[in-house]
C-alpha cells in the first residue's frame, strides 16, 4: 500500500529536489496541530500567532482577545491558564526543565476584570506545580516539595504539608520514578470536581538508593547530580494518599486514604486517582509484582470526616499471562450514576477492549470486541461513548474515532473518522468540549496533518482549524520517499512493517537497508503517521531503504504478541528484527552486504543485541543511549516485564540478557555507541559498561558522548548527533560524501 506516492513525472523532475540533512535539522518540514483549550461547551481559547490569548465562540463564530501579547510580554510569559470563573489568568515564565514532564516556573496572576496583575501575597518562586480549582479561582501549588492553597489569588496561602524535603519527601509532585514510569505527569494532586476537596500523594524516598553523576558545566569543579532512583530490585518509594477539605483546610487537616488490605500486605504502587463526585474518589493500586491491580472506590464519611473504602467497592484486575494492563493499567471513566464505569482491559480472547463494570469485574459487560484493540476512551456522555481503536481495515497502526450510542438498546457503533479524508487521515486523536457538544479531530497522517472542528451531535465538520498549507506548499518541490505499510506472516506471528523507499525506487536494483528499531514492550513503531525526519532524508537523498518492524512485545495486536516477551526481554524482540531482515533480503532489492540497524533507548538495547547476534546479517549499527543490563534500569518499568533480579525469581535472565555478555560478538561489526553523560533516565553507566566489556574483549568500536546531555540529546547536540550518525552510515554503506 503506497501511502505517499512520489512525484516522478519527467517534466517536474528538474524542479524537484531531495531532502537534505539541513532540512531535517532546521525543522523545515515540521507540522502544526491545533488543540482547542476548551472553557465551556462552545468556547475555547487559543494563543494566536502574535501571542494574544483569544476566546472563540463556535456558535456565534465570534472571537475576541482576553489577554494581550503586551501583557504576556511584560512578564515574558510562555504559557497561561484561565481560572474557571474567568476572573484570573496565571502567566507562566522562567520555564526550567527538570525531568521528562517536570519543570519549575515563575507564576504571575493577572486580574481580567481590573486589567492588572494581582499585587500582594505574590506567589513564591520557583514553583514546581500550580493549578486552578475546577470551579472558581482557588489555587493549589507546590513549592519546595510542600503544597499550598489559596482561596483567592490575592489571599495569603494556607500551607497544607510541612514535611517536604528535597530528594526525600515529595508532596503533590512525583519523585523521579513515579513521574517517568507510573504517573507520566509532573503533578500528584487532584481537585475534586467542584473544588471541595484536594487529594494528593506523598512520596517518601528516604531509603531509595541514589544515582549520582557529574554535571560538568563551566565551573572549575563539576557538580554532582543526585537522584533517588530505584533500580530493579532496589528499595522503592513509599506512597501515601491524603485528602484535604479546601473550604476548611485547618478543621481536620489532611486525611489519609486507606490502602486495600490485599495490596498493603507487600510492596505496592499507587497508579492513579480519579474523582467521581466531590465525595467519592477512585484510587488504583498495584502490587510490586505488577500482575495484580486493585481499583478502590472510596466515600467521604461526613460524621467522621474520613474516607471509607469498603471491600465491596474493590475491583481486582489480574493478568495470568503477563503484567496488568498495557503500558500502564487503564483508568476508569465513570458514568453519570457515579458508581459504574467503563474501562479497557483484556477480554477472554486476549484483546484489550472496553468493558462496563456495574457491580463486579466478573460481571463486566463487554462493549467492544474483535481481533483488534480499543485504545482510549475519550468521553462518556449520557448517550454516547467516544473511543479510539485500530479496528478499521485491520491495520494495527491506524487510529480512528468511534461513537457508541449507550442511550439506546442495542447500542449502535459508528466510525466518526474512517471515511473523512481516507487517504490523508488514518491516525486520529480527539479533544472534546464540555458535554461533548463539540470536538476537535487532530489527524496525524499518513498525509499532511490536519485539525478540524466538529459538531458533537451530528459529527458534521464545522471548520478547519489547521491544515498546514505552508508545509504543503514547501513540500511541492521535494522528492519525498515512498512509504508502505505491509505485514509478514512468520511461524504464526504477524510482523507489521513500514518500509521507506527512495523516490525513484526500482525493484530490480539493490539498495542498502537500515533497520530503525525501538521494540520496547507495549510500543508501536509501525504507525500511519506523517513524518519528514532523518530517515526520510536517508531515503530521499542517500538512496537507502529504511524499515521499521513491530515484533513480539509490541502493542495493540493482542496479548499473545504483547506478553510474549514477559520475563524474557531481549530475546524475541531481537529475533523478530532478524527474521524481518531475512524476509526483506528475499524480496530481492536489498544489498545483503549493506545492512545496518540503529535504535535509541530500548531501541539501542535491541540494536546492540541484534548486532551481537552472530548472524552476520548486519555490517554496522548504532546504539543511542542504550540500556545494557536490566539491573541498571528503573524498578517500576523493569520489574513490570522482568520480575525481580533475585535467585528465586528471574536473576538468571537478567544476567543472560545483558549487552556486555555478548561483547565478543561485536568483533565482526562496526559499532557506534552514543550516550549523554547527564542521562537521568538510562544512565551513562549503561554505555560505560558496554565500552568496558568491549575494551576487555579487545573489540574495536566507535563511540561518542555528549557532555551534560540527557536522554533526549537536544539542542546543538541533536545536529551533531545526526551529522555524526549520517557520516557513520555513509561510510558503512560506501556512499560518497
Amino acid at each position: 500500500i503506497v501511502l505517499r506516492p512520489s512525484r516522478v513525472h519527467n517534466s517536474e523532475e528538474n524542479t524537484m529536489r531531495a531532502l537534505t540533512l539541513k532540512d531535517i535539522l532546521n525543522g523545515t518540514f515540521s507540522y502544526k496541530t491545533f488543540f482547542p483549550n476548551w472553557i465551556s461547551g462552545q468556547e475555547y481559547l487559543h494563543q494566536s500567532a502574535d501571542n494574544n490569548i483569544v476566546l472563540y465562540n463556535i456558535e456565534t463564530g465570534q472571537s475576541y482577545t482576553i489577554l494581550s501579547n503586551r501583557t504576556m510580554k511584560s512578564v515574558n510569559a510562555s504559557n497561561y491558564g484561565l481560572s474557571p470563573d474567568r476572573q484570573f489568568v496565571y502567566l507562566e515564565s522562567d520555564y526550567s526543565k527538570l525531568w521528562r514532564y517536570s519543570y519549575t516556573a515563575t507564576y504571575y496572576i493577572y486580574d481580567l476584570s481590573n486589567g492588572e496583575f494581582v499585587r500582594g501575597n505574590e506567589l513564591p518562586r520557583p514553583i514546581q506545580y500550580l493549578c486552578w480549582s475546577p470551579v472558581g479561582s482557588k489555587l493549589a501549588y507546590v513549592y519546595q516539595n510542600n503544597i499550598y492553597l489559596k482561596q483567592r489569588p490575592g489571599d495569603p496561602p494556607f500551607q497544607i504539608t510541612f514535611n517536604g524535603r528535597e530528594n526525600k519527601i515529595f508532596n503533590g509532585i512525583p519523585d523521579w520514578v513515579y513521574e517517568e514510569e507510573m504517573l507520566a505527569t509532573k503533578y500528584a494532586l487532584w481537585w475534586s470536581p467542584n473544588g471541595k476537596f484536594l487529594a494528593y500523594a506523598e512520596f517518601n524516598d528516604t531509603d531509595i538508593p541514589v544515582i549520582a553523576y557529574s554535571y560538568y558545566g563551566d565551573e572549575q569543579y563539576p557538580r554532582t547530580i543526585n537522584i533517588p532512583y530505584p533500580k530493579a530490585g532496589a528499595k522503592n518509594p513509599v506512597v501515601r494518599i491524603f485528602i484535604i477539605d479546601t473550604t476548611y483546610p485547618a478543621y481536620v487537616g489532611p486525611q489519609e486514604v486507606p490502602v486495600p488490605a490485599m495490596i498493603a500486605s507487600s510492596d505496592y504502587y499507587f497508579s492513579w486517582l480519579t474523582w467521581v463526585t466531590d465525595e467519592r474518589v477512585c484510587l488504583q493500586w498495584l502490587k510490586r509484582v505488577q500482575n495484580v491491580s486493585v481499583l478502590s472506590i472510596c466515600d467521604f464519611r461526613e460524621d467522621w470526616q474520613t474516607w471509607d473504602c469498603p471491600k465491596t467497592q474493590e475491583h481486582i484486575e489480574e493478568s495470568r499471562t503477563g503484567w496488568a494492563g498495557g503500558f500502564f493499567v487503564s483508568t476508569p471513566v465513570f458514568s453519570y450514576d457515579a458508581i459504574s464505569y467503563y474501562k479497557i482491559f483484556s477480554d477472554k480472547d486476549g484483546y484489550k477492549h472496553i468493558h462496563y463494570i456495574k457491580d463486579t469485574v466478573e460481571n463486566a459487560i463487554q462493549i467492544t470486541s474483535g481481533k483488534w484493540e480499543a485504545i482510549n476512551i475519550f468521553r462518556v456522555t449520557q448517550d454516547s461513548l467516544f473511543y479510539s481503536s485500530n479496528e478499521f481495515e485491520e491495520y494495527p497502526g491506524r487510529r480512528n474515532i468511534y461513537r457508541i450510542s449507550i442511550g439506546s438498546y442495542p447500542p449502535s457503533k459508528k466510525c466518526v473518522t474512517c471515511h473523512l479524508r481516507k487517504e490523508r487521515c488514518q491516525y486520529y486523536t480527539a479533544s472534546f468540549s464540555d458535554y461533548a457538544k463539540y470536538y476537535a479531530l487532530v489527524c496525524y497522517g499518513p498525509g499532511i496533518p490536519i485539525s478540524t472542528l466538529h459538531d458533537g451531535r451530528t459529527d458534521q465538520e464545522i471548520k478547519i482549524l489547521e491544515e498546514n498549507k505552508e508545509l504543503e506548499n514547501a513540500l511541492k518541490n521535494i522528492q519525498l520517499p515512498k512509504e508502505e505499510i505491509k505485514k509478514l506472516e512468520v511461524d504464526e506471528i504477524t510482523l507489521w512493517y513500514k518500509m521507506i523507499l527512495p523516490p525513484q525506487f526500482d525493484r530490480s536494483k539493490k539498495y542498502p537497508l537500515l533497520i530503525q528499531v525501538y521494540g520496547g514492550p507495549c510500543s508501536q513503531s509501525v504507525r500511519s503517521v506523517f513524518a519528514v525526519n532523518w530517515i526520510s532524508y536517508l531515503a530521499s537523498k542517500e538512496g537507502m531503504v529504511i524499515a521499521l518492524v513491530d515484533g513480539r512485545g509490541t502493542a495493540f495486536q493482542g496479548d499473545k504478541l504483547l506478553y510474549a516477551v514477559y520475563r524474557k526481554l531481549g530475546v524475541y524482540e531481537v529475533e523478530d528484527q532478524i527474521t524481518a531482515v531475512r524476509k526483506f533480503i528475499e524480496m530481492g532489492f536489498i544489498d545483503e552486504k549493506r545492512i545496518a540497524i540503529w535504535g535509541w533507548s530500548y531501541g539501542g538495547y535491541v540494536s546492540s543485541l541484534a548486532l551481537a547476534s552472530g548472524t552476520g546479517l548486519f555490517k554496522c549499527g548504532i546504539a543511542v543511549a542504550p540500556v545494557s543490563s536490566w539491573e541498571y534500569y528503573a524498578s517500576v518499568y523493569t520489574e513490570r516485564f522482568m520480575g525481580l533480579p533475585t535467585k528465586d525469581d528471574n536473576l538468571e535472565h537478567y544476567k543472560n540478557s545483558t549487552v556486555m555478555a555478548r561483547a565478543e560478538y561485536f568483533r565482526n561489526v562496526d559499532y557506534l555507541l552514543i550516550h549523554g553523560t547527564a542521562d537521568d533516565n538510562v544512565h551513562f553507566q549503561n554505555s560505560a559498561q558496554i565500552a568496558k566489556a568491549l575494551v576487555n574483549a579487545q573489540v574495536d568500536f566507535q563511540a561518542m558522548w555528549y557532555s551534560d546531555q540527557n536522554h533526549g540529546l537536544s539542542g546543538l547536540s541533536t545536529n551533531h548527533l545526526y551529522t555524526h550518525m549520517t557520516h557513520f552510515l555513509k561510510q558503512c554503506f560506501s556512499l560518497s560524501d
Epitope: 465551556s40 461547551g41 462552545q42 468556547e43 476566546l55 465562540n57 456558535e59 456565534t60 465570534q62 475576541y64 482577545t65 482576553i66 489577554l67 494581550s68 501583557t71 484561565l82 474567568r86 476572573q87 481580567l112 476584570s113 486589567g115 457538544k437
Partner: nanobody, 117 residues
Framework: QVQLQESGGGLVQTGGSLRLSCAAS????????MGWYRQALGNQRELVAG???????YYPDSVKGRFTISRDNDKNTIYLQMNSLKPEDTAVYYC???????????WGQGTQVTVSS
Amino acid sequence: QVQLQESGGGLVQTGGSLRLSCAASGSIFVGNAMGWYRQALGNQRELVAGITSDGITYYPDSVKGRFTISRDNDKNTIYLQMNSLKPEDTAVYYCNLWPPRIGFASWGQGTQVTVSS
C-alpha cells in the same frame, strides 16, 4: 457603537431584593458569555455571576443561593435577581462579557446598589 446599559439599582434594606437589567447593543454580546461584576468603594472589581450562551451559570460562594443570573437572548438583555441582600453587597454593579474583552473601554456607567442595615 457597542454599549452596555445597566439599570435597576437602588437603596434597599438588609434582606431585601433587587432585579438588575443590562441591555447590550452590538454584535459582540449576541450569544457570548456575559457576567455581572461589582466594585465596592476602595475595592477591586469582582465577578458576582456569569452565564454562558447556553445558560450554564456560575456564582462565587459569597452570593451563591442568593443571586440568580439569567438572559433573554431575544431582547439582548441579561438580568441579576438579588435576594437576601446584605450590607456587604453594596457596590456599583456592571455587566460585561465574561471574561471581559481587553481594551474594551466601554464598561457601562454601572448601577449603584446600596444595602442599609
